[in-house]
């Protein structure tokens, strides 16, 4: 018996060939011997089967002795043995119809689980072999689960259902809802304007939800909510904002926040959360602010940084075009009785400058000038 695999919703064509290459009488029946379709001369006739409106044949092939049964919009329950009767012969074809679907929404939050469910006919014992967009293979039976979805899991999942050494292939598009970056650091000199951007790693027609930025300043004992906002069809509206600092927020995506001035008391780390409508759970992005200040008080030139810096970062003070006078893995460095000239305070990571602040030291009878 020939086995044919079909895909739920697709069209299948079951073949039946006579030895005579001419139009002769044929009919297709199901395993219950109920007639599906056949011919009367050059006319297609249909029987009382459940397939009535979805069954067809190709009249153009009858003259060649081919009498196919075409079933449109396949359903799992179409799985059956179909019998073609032609020239006193019976050709049997077993049709097995499978469906593979994501059991929840195909738009999932980062960290959530994806479950693919296989619909299969009774008595079948298929296996499912799926491949993620990043090339990872996963095998399963009736269900296949992937926990802790990552951003790289967004895209087309390709799956092969195997039964009786035959296969049927599926593709499922999955969107992992996440921010483009899990974390970011902004380095600013004291007094500069700070721009925080929170680009999303996905695009959808309508995006509705609400969000909040909580901030833990390095100098503060507890975190506080800096801003809350609503998102409606990709339009942003601020609900509540602290008075200090007075943040401003862009009205369109990507989510964009502006802090008028970088000050030591604001240095620290924040967590922006976004709750999307009809989704359980939230999207998160961490943002960090590092602030630098260079000052001269009497005979002491000091450079300080505030905020989350890693131990490998180097802070140094140097007179321009000269070797660094002081260079330490510390958050503050100073030089006593600095020479006159333009001094540079540098925060660097393996030689790459992350932040730079210049201060002009005048001869001792003058007061310093900050450019």
């Amino acid at each position: 018996k020939k086995v044919v695999l079909g895909k739920k919703g697709d069209t299948v064509e079951l073949t039946c060939t006579a030895s005579q290459k001419k139009s002769i009488q044929f009919h297709w029946k199901n395993s219950n011997q109920i007639k599906i379709l056949g011919n009367q001369g050059s006319f297609l006739t249909k029987g009382p089967s459940k397939l009535n409106d979805r069954a067809d044949s190709r009249r153009s092939l009858w003259d060649q002795g081919n009498f196919p049964l075409i079933i449109k919009n396949l359903k799992i329950e179409d799985s059956d043995t179909y019998i073609c009767e032609v020239e006193d012969q019976k050709e049997e074809v077993q049709l097995l119809v499978f469906g593979l679907t994501a059991n929840s929404d195909t738009h999932l939050l980062q960290g959530q689980s994806l479950t693919l469910t296989l619909e299969s006919p009774p008595g079948s014992s298929p296996s499912v072999q799926c491949r993620s967009p990043r090339g990872k293979n996963i095998q399963g039976g009736k269900t296949l689960s992937v926990s802790q979805l990552e951003l790289q899991d967004s895209g087309t999942w390709t799956c092969t259902v195997l039964q009786n050494q035959k296969k049927v292939e599926f593709k499922i598009d999955i969107v992992v809802l996440a921010f483009q970056k899990a974390s970011s650091i902004v380095y600013k000199k004291e007094g500069e304007q700070v721009e925080f951007s929170f680009p999303l790693a996905f695009t959808v027609e309508k995006l509705t939800g609400s969000g909040e930025l909580w901030w833990q300043a390095e100098r503060a004992s507890s975190s506080k909510s800096w801003i809350t906002f609503d998102l409606k069809n990709k339009e942003v509206s601020v609900k509540r904002v602290t008075q200090d600092p007075k943040l401003q927020m862009g009205k369109k995506l990507p989510l964009h926040l502006t802090l008028p001035q970088a000050l030591p008391q604001y240095a620290g780390s924040g967590n922006l959360t976004l709750a999307l409508e009809a989704k359980t759970g939230k999207l998160h992005q961490e943002v960090n602010l590092v602030v630098m200040r260079a000052t001269q008080l009497q005979k002491n030139l000091t450079c300080e940084v505030w905020g989350p810096t890693s131990p490998k970062l180097m802070l140094s003070l140097k007179l321009e075009n000269k070797e660094a006078k002081v260079s330490k893995r510390e958050k503050a460095v100073w030089v006593l009785n600095p020479e006159a000239g333009m001094w540079q305070c540098l925060l660097s990571d393996s030689g790459q400058v992350l932040l730079e602040s210049n201060i002009k030291v005048l001869p001792t009878w003058s007061t310093p000038v900050q450019p």
């Epitope: 072999q129 799926c130 491949r131 967009p133 990043r134 090339g135 990872k136 293979n137 095998q139 895209g155 087309t156 390709t158 799956c159 092969t160 195997l162 296969k167 292939e169 593709k171």
Partner: antibody
Framework: EVQLQESGPSLVKPSQTLSLTCSVT????????WNWIRKFPGHKLEFLGY???????NYNPSLKSRVSITRDTSKNQFDLQLKSVTTEDTATYHC????????????WGQGISVTVSS | DIHLTQTTSSLSASLGDRVTIICRAS??????LNWYQLKPDGTLKLLIY???RLHSGVPSRFSGSGSGTEYSLTISNLEREDVATYFC????????FGAGTKLELK
Amino acid sequence: EVQLQESGPSLVKPSQTLSLTCSVTGDSITSGYWNWIRKFPGHKLEFLGYISFADTTNYNPSLKSRVSITRDTSKNQFDLQLKSVTTEDTATYHCARDDYGYYAMDYWGQGISVTVSS
Amino acid sequence: DIHLTQTTSSLSASLGDRVTIICRASQDIDNYLNWYQLKPDGTLKLLIYYTSRLHSGVPSRFSGSGSGTEYSLTISNLEREDVATYFCQQGNTLPTFGAGTKLELK
């Protein structure tokens, strides 16, 4: 029977783009996964990438910026492009089929020897 | 990257011998381990896929086993035509290959 046949230049100059074609008979490239693998002179094997029945691609991360695989379903062919080649890319390039998605290459082309030299 | 180590780079055996080739993975590969035969004429053939499934047309003297990070290919009754280099390859993620084991006759 399934057959795969590689074609393209056997000599490529450094910094140029290597372009190879795999012609498939006996199966349709709109089903399964279609791969490129190369074999270095010492028999070391390296996976380059694949194109799937769904027209999705994946590449070896070490070559990602240089490699591209495309297909032409009307000709039942799929192509490999490797940019900015160096002498290190001298190898025998094979195309292969993975029918069921296990990365199990059940049919291989006989391979095409490519030398990168000025 | 998942690294595969074939502990023996070459081995000699006599006709009729039982030969086992070992392949170790740097992490659990969930049984996605395939074995290939590279003949001296350069032809590559799939022998075993998904640890123990025999590819169609491959003689039953070839078998595979293993789990986690340790896998093996066994030829139960060595024949002259089995002289070749054998490669393991993981298919858990984007494929990587072992360095190969060259099998010769004593």
